[in-house]
């Protein structure tokens, strides 16, 4: 629960609690903003972002945005509040523990975005869930 000596604010979002009334702590996300990337035509990629940050707000989740146009490929890694759109899109998969990329319609470029809610989950971006090695069925195939 909220410690009695911690000042409670009239603004409800200032101290975020879980269903049991415990203070909700923020998660860790890769946070390099936009960087050039070599990730292309792969089932999954690592972010190659060396910066892990504590998200500013406890309700924020990790986000990764992969963009490809005629000139370059970029990967964006940030924290973001799933109640708010990002790049004009709703974060539909914010509760997922893994960052599963989904393509979004953007004119003039190929645009994929994912969000997830476990520590540093936007470090490993997955374009094809069926090939993700944390899938128990796939591990079964590998070890048979």
């Amino acid at each position: 629960t909220i410690p009695p000596h911690v000042q409670k604010s009239v603004n409800n979002d200032m101290i975020v609690t879980d269903n049991n009334g415990a203070v909700k702590f923020p998660q860790l996300c890769k946070f390099c903003d936009v960087r050039f990337s070599t990730c292309d035509n792969q089932k999954s990629c690592m972010s190659n972002c060396s910066i892990t940050s504590i998200c500013e707000k406890p309700q924020e989740v990790c986000v990764a945005v992969w963009r490809k146009n005629d000139e370059n490929i970029t990967l964006e890694t940030v924290c973001h509040d799933p109640k708010l759109p990002y790049h004009d899109f709703i974060l539909e998969d914010a509760a997922s523990p893994k960052c599963i990329m989904k393509e979004k319609k953007k004119p003039g470029e190929t645009f994929f975005m994912c969000s997830c809610s476990s520590d540093e989950c936007n470090d490993n971006i997955i374009f094809s869930e069926e090939y993700n090695t944390s899938n128990p069925d796939l591990l079964l195939v590998i070890f048979q």
């Epitope: 879980d18 049991n20 415990a22 203070v23 702590f25 860790l28 504590i54």
Partner: nanobody, 122 residues
Amino acid sequence: EVQLLESGGGLVQPGGSLRLSCAASGFTFGTEQMWWVRQAPGKGLEFVSRIDSPGGRTYYANSVKGRFTISRDNSKNTLYLQMNSLRAEDTAVYYCAKRRPTGVSGTFYDYWGQGTLVTVSS
């Protein structure tokens, strides 16, 4: 009984330094994830820094990265926060907190100290 007792706060000029300490007792300090969390007057909680155990990996909020350093001395059951290049916006009550999973997925017990006030002003 779990106890966390912060010390080291005070008045410091902008650009100055302070070192906060948090003395822990009543639990096995060396195995716990520890945090520094601050609350400015009339504002919400800001989660400043985290140190994991084992391994001692450290993490920071963007607002303090490069200026603050979290560390721990498991032999003394003490958590530290070295704060350099202090700014007026760092003025807050600083709490140390510990966090442990309950065993139920996604839920945690947390324990908090009473806090120590840091005032950055000329």
